[in-house]
């Protein structure tokens, strides 16, 4: 799996969208975890609702929010009030029992607000990160997400 690099501004929200095959992962909960070192374990940050049919509901742990559109096959993670300490390697995961399958690896980079930089000359506006492997970034507060209710069978 390639790693998607996403950049966000400190103090703002970063939204990550991990896409997956909705049929392949039907019934599976999703999770967002932080990789501890290159070969280390991935520490769970937040996972979707325990009841798969309610996966569209936002679930929060601290400043991280997750929600899964199981019909579209998109799990969205929002890192609110991004801090320098949030930088690092993460994974979107699909869960089956005690097993976790990596859907996507995401490297989060936190950019300092140039307005807070005493040495800043010209105002620098970061480029939008390129969108590939189904991941994208927004340099703004996340919008509300309307999601259809998943099928019951």
């Amino acid at each position: 799996l390639n790693t998607t690099v996403l950049q966000g501004m400190a103090g703002q929200s970063l939204r990550v969208s991990c896409t997956y095959d909705a049929l392949k992962h039907w019934g599976r909960r999703k999770a967002w975890c932080r990789q501890l070192g290159e070969e280390g374990p991935c520490q769970r940050v937040v996972s979707t609702h325990g009841v798969w049919l309610l996966a569209f509901l936002k679930k929060r742990n601290g400043s991280t929010v997750i929600a899964d559109d199981t019909l579209a096959g998109t799990v969205t993670i929002t890192l609110k009030n991004l801090q320098a300490g949030d930088a690092g390697l993460y994974q979107c995961q699909s869960l089956r029992g005690r097993e976790a399958e990596v859907l996507q690896k995401v490297l989060v980079e936190v950019l300092e607000d140039p307005l807070d930089d005493q040495d800043a000359g010209d105002l620098w506006v970061p480029e939008e990160s390129s969108s590939f492997e189904g991941a994208q970034v927004e340099h703004s507060t996340s919008r509300n997400q309307e999601t259809s209710f998943p099928p019951t069978s």
Epitope: L23, K24, H25, W26, G27, R28, R29, G50, G97, E99
Partner: antibody, heavy 118, light 113 residues
């Protein structure tokens, strides 16, 4: 009607290669996991591995990793179980089974009996 | 690997009576996050392929009569067949799928007295 139709019985000699098949019909073959299960004569069931034909994502039981190859051709809705060098201990009935993404198996093929004897 | 142990090995039953088959796992099959217990039951009738009876501890598969019920928690599980009929004969297997490799119990052969 969902059906999994397996290839016929095989009699082989040790060291020979073999590929058996499982053809799915009555459903979207690419969109369901498909497992292989072994049953040695007079014994119980053993899970060998599973494949998702949509992208050929394959998982093996450690007991069968390197011993067999699981593959699928979604264009003809067929999954395969393959050996490069058979042993007498491979003599068994082999079942394919359609699985959900949570890995329980709702439809089974009729089985393929493989006999390996010199 | 998770080891699944079934008892008894053989179970002679009288039609109309209730049969109970036990299955024990070497590790808990309960996922504490979603509350599901990843334990299924299959029946292999004589000369036939296996068929799914019960999945995720207690959910009956499509077309399975309500005479079949699954229960248990953690590591100890039971399949109950009430009002046993002649067509219920065969070998019953429990299977865990909380982690790979998926593993089956050794089977319990149910026969009519």
């Amino acid at each position: 009607e969902v059906q999994l139709v397996q290839s016929g019985s095989e009699v082989k000699k040790p060291g020979e290669s073999l590929r058996i098949s499982c053809k799915g019909s009555g459903y979207s073959f690419s969109s369901y996991w498909l497992a292989w299960v072994r049953q040695m004569p007079g014994k119980g069931l053993e899970w060998m591995g599973i494949i998702y034909p949509g992208d050929s994502d394959t998982r093996y039981s450690p007991s069968f990793q390197g011993q067999v190859t699981i593959s699928a051709d979604k264009s003809i809705s067929t999954a395969y179980l393959q050996w490069s060098s058979l042993k007498a201990s491979d003599t068994a009935m082999y079942y394919c089974a359609r699985g959900t993404p949570l890995f329980y198996f709702t439809y089974w093929g009729q089985g393929t009996l493989v006999t390996v004897s010199s | 690997d998770i080891v699944m142990t079934q008892t008894p090995l053989s179970l002679p039953v009288t039609p109309g009576e209730t049969a109970s088959i036990s299955c024990r796992s070497s590790q808990s099959l309960l996922d504490s996050e979603d509350g599901n217990t990843y334990l299924d039951w299959y029946l292999q009738k004589p000369g036939q392929s296996p068929q799914l009876l019960i999945y995720t501890l207690s959910y009956r598969a499509s077309g399975v009569p309500d005479r079949f019920s699954g229960s248990g928690s953690g590591t100890d599980f039971t399949l109950k067949i009430s009002r046993v009929e002649a067509e219920d004969v065969g070998v019953y297997y429990c299977m865990q799928r909380i982690e790979s490799p998926l593993t089956f119990g050794g089977g319990t052969k149910v026969e009519i007295k």
